[in-house]
């Protein structure tokens, strides 16, 4: 049997050591003990007695099925306890009585049906994070379960086989910053929602089939809910249940962010928010994020005209990797307050983009992200976006563009352009001179000779440049990142010719460690202030005897350098 390995600060690692019991020889010097992925099965009352100063105890996936009632009695300093993914079919309040310093407790993934006969947590007054439940057996949440807990930063409950929720069970916790609920269906959702309205700031609902969700008025008095964010992950919705969910918003008037991640919509987008009050109550929602939305019949999807009015005040919208090929012109015109739009990883082409960015579309838009779509012509894309009078930032990275022409038109306020991973081989005057930030990283550029008088930041890593670009091209440059090119050297003159340069990242290039380069790096200790990735990323490529040495450590041969 292997032994623990401990460092000088008392952090001990015993993961995956085939322990069949808590190892002997534990001491008060130990601050952290990780015994995950073992086959311990049993923790006796004296096994941890010596660990009086232990702050972290991790026993994840160690096949534990029995813990004696007083096994943790000496762990008064313990702040972090992870008992997840073990075989504990029942939980005992006596384990937690002595753990008055505990801040983090993970009991998830054990096969208990309830949290125990009596309240587990009354003494855990410092608890900040609690994770409970499992996929298959945890079936009941009761009023006694959270007694004693008044405030939590994070509460995660995996109740995917929930059969009974006792009303007001979660109400006793007065303040929960982030509640994650794994519920397989919506049966108890309204009851739970009523109980957490006045306490939860961020509610995340996971893996829930909401297809049959039906709203009914909540039995609550006028509450001022602190909820700012609502997220659905891995959930299933229909057009009808979406309408029903919208009705919950009347209870969370401070909501500012809604997120749908990896959800499925078994519908056509035929939403009909029937009640006009819903529209006004969406008033404070500023951010809507949708990622990986799966719509089996996306080719029959409606134009969303029924929800135009819902989104008039929204400032940030992300719809990522969801087969978007068109935002109808009339929809774009309704998004009057929109400042940020991210349509990454979709199916946009110039022809449909033209309809989306029609006259009057997105009048307040400042940032547009069209990364990884099906755009081909930089010239057409720029021209189409001329309608966006307030656009300052455009990301069209990860599109495969045809070679760029000599001249293009762009929105006049544009200051930031991301052309990374677009396969470009040459930069031409198509790129606007108004730019302050340009990203052309991960392309096939072997030179850069474009005058950009206002450019403050240039990102040109992962290309094929052999030298730093000429400083006269960028008179006000502050930041240049040119990692992973074929740059062989840089000199005092080169760096000195960038009058305002504050940050240079030039590591992982093919440096020829010549006498000049090594002399310069030895004589210039201030390099560390400008080269942010110095010294570890600056290695000699040649001569062979110095290959792999850091420039900082490499010493030129006296013979070579003083001939």
């Amino acid at each position: 049997q292997e032994s623990l390995s401990c460092d000088a600060s008392g952090v001990c690692d015993g993961r995956s050591r085939s322990f069949t019991s808590i190892p002997s020889g534990l001491t008060a010097a130990m601050k952290s003990l990780d015994l995950s992925f073992n086959k311990i099965t049993y923790i006796g009352h004296g096994d941890l007695r010596a660990c009086a100063n232990l702050q972290v105890l991790i026993l994840k996936s160690s096949r534990i099925n029995t813990i004696e009632g007083d096994a943790f009695y000496s762990l008064g300093s313990l702040e972090h306890l992870d008992l997840s993914d073990n075989h504990l079919s029942s939980l005992s309040s006596s384990w937690f009585g002595p753990l008055s310093s505990l801040k983090y407790l993970n009991l998830m993934g054990n096969p208990y049906q309830t949290l125990g006969v009596t309240s587990l947590f009354p003494n855990l007054t410092n608890l900040q994070t609690l994770r409970i439940g499992n996929v298959e057996t945890f079936s009941e949440i009761r009023r006694i379960d959270f007694a004693g807990l008044t405030s939590l930063n994070e509460l995660e409950i995996k109740a995917l086989s929930l059969r009974n929720y006792q009303s007001q069970s979660l109400k006793s916790i007065r303040d929960i910053h982030h509640l994650t609920l794994h519920l397989s269906e919506s049966a108890f959702l309204l009851e739970i929602f009523a109980d957490i309205l006045s306490s939860v700031r961020y509610l995340e609902l996971r893996d829930t089939n909401l297809a049959r969700f039906q709203f009914s008025p909540l039995p609550v008095d006028e509450v001022s809910s602190p909820m700012k964010k609502l997220a659905f992950r891995g959930s299933v919705l229909t057009d009808e249940s979406f309408n029903e969910l919208l009705k919950l918003l009347r209870y969370i008037l401070e909501l500012s962010e809604v997120e749908f991640d990896d959800c499925t919509l078994n519908g056509l987008g035929d939403f009909n928010p029937s009640e006009s009050d819903v529209v006004s109550e969406l008033g404070k929602v500023e951010t809507v994020t949708i990622r990986r939305l799966h719509i089996p019949q996306f080719y029959l999807f409606y134009d969303l005209s029924t929800v135009y009015s819902l989104l008039e005040k929204v400032k940030r919208i992300t719809v990522e990797n969801s087969k978007v090929f068109l935002v109808p012109c009339s929809f774009s015109q309704h998004l009057k307050s929109l400042e940020f739009l991210d349509l990454s990883e979709n199916l946009m082409v110039e022809e449909y983009l033209k309809n989306s960015a029609c006259k009057g579309a997105w009048p307040s838009l400042q940032t547009l992200v069209l990364s990884q779509n099906h755009l081909r012509s930089m010239q057409k894309t720029g021209e189409i976006l001329l309608t966006l009078k307030n656009l300052t930032s455009l990301d069209i990275s990860r599109n495969t563009f045809h070679p760029m022409p000599d001249s293009c038109q762009w929105p006049e306020k544009m200051r930031f352009l991301n052309l990374s991973s677009t396969g470009i081989r040459v930069v031409k005057t198509c790129i606007p001179q108004t730019l302050e930030v340009l990203d052309v990283s991960n392309n096939n550029l072997d030179s850069f000779s474009l005058f950009l008088p206002r450019l403050q930041e240039l990102y040109i890593s992962r290309n094929k440049l052999k030298t730093l670009p000429d400083a006269s091209l960028f008179p006000v440059l502050l930041v240049m990142k040119i990692r992973e090119n074929a740059v062989s050297t840089f000199s005092k003159d080169q760096l000195g010719s960038f009058p305002k340069l504050e940050t240079l990242e030039a590591g992982d290039n093919h440096f020829v460690c010549s006498c000049e380069l090594l002399s310069f790096t030895m004589e210039t200790p201030a390099l560390a202030q400008i080269l942010v990735d110095w010294p570890d990323s600056y290695l000699c490529d040649s001569p062979p005897r110095l290959h792999g040495h850091r420039l900082q450590d490499a010493r030129p041969s006296v013979l070579e350098c003083h001939q």
């Epitope: 995917l160 086989s161 397989s184 996971r206 893996d207 089939n209 992950r233 891995g234 990986r292």
Partner: nanobody, 122 residues
Framework: EVQLVESGGGLVQAGGSLRLSCAAS????????MSWFRQAPGKEREFVAV????????DYSTSVKGRFTIFRDNAKNTVYLETTSLELEDTAVYYC???????????????WGQGTPVTVSS
């Protein structure tokens, strides 16, 4: 109505691996949550693993976590269970199940296969 057919079971030595497959008929496969359960001789049927509609969420029973992997290919209407580091206690008939709800509770699954036997020998 979805029909499920499991395959890939067999005799394997302790420490070995098997890939179990479950082929589904019907065009609505991607709408189903898919699960694997198992039943050892003389014991109750127990949950093994579950995967959601898209494959974005997976969960495992404690006894197989870290050793088994569930994944699905919606284009092929198939869900798989990759089993590694097999132990004697893994000997059972393995069933795949399809349902509307992401859960480890067998009662919530409407469609079941006929099972494929896995025998782990020392």
């Amino acid at each position: 109505e979805v029909q499920l057919v499991e395959s890939g079971g067999g005799l394997v030595q302790a420490g070995g691996s098997l890939r179990l497959s479950c082929a589904a008929s019907g065009r609505t496969f991607s709408r189903y949550v898919m699960s694997w359960f198992r039943q050892a001789p003389g014991k109750e049927r127990e949950f093994v693993a579950v995967i959601n509609w898209s494959g974005g969420s997976t969960d495992y029973s404690t006894s197989v976590k870290g050793r088994f992997t569930i994944f699905r290919d919606n284009a092929k209407n198939t869900v798989y269970l990759e089993t590694t580091s097999l132990e004697l206690e893994d000997t059972a008939v393995y069933y795949c199940a399809a349902g509307e709800y992401y859960t480890g509770a067998s009662s919530r699954y409407d469609h079941w296969g006929q099972g494929t036997p896995v025998t782990v020998s020392s």
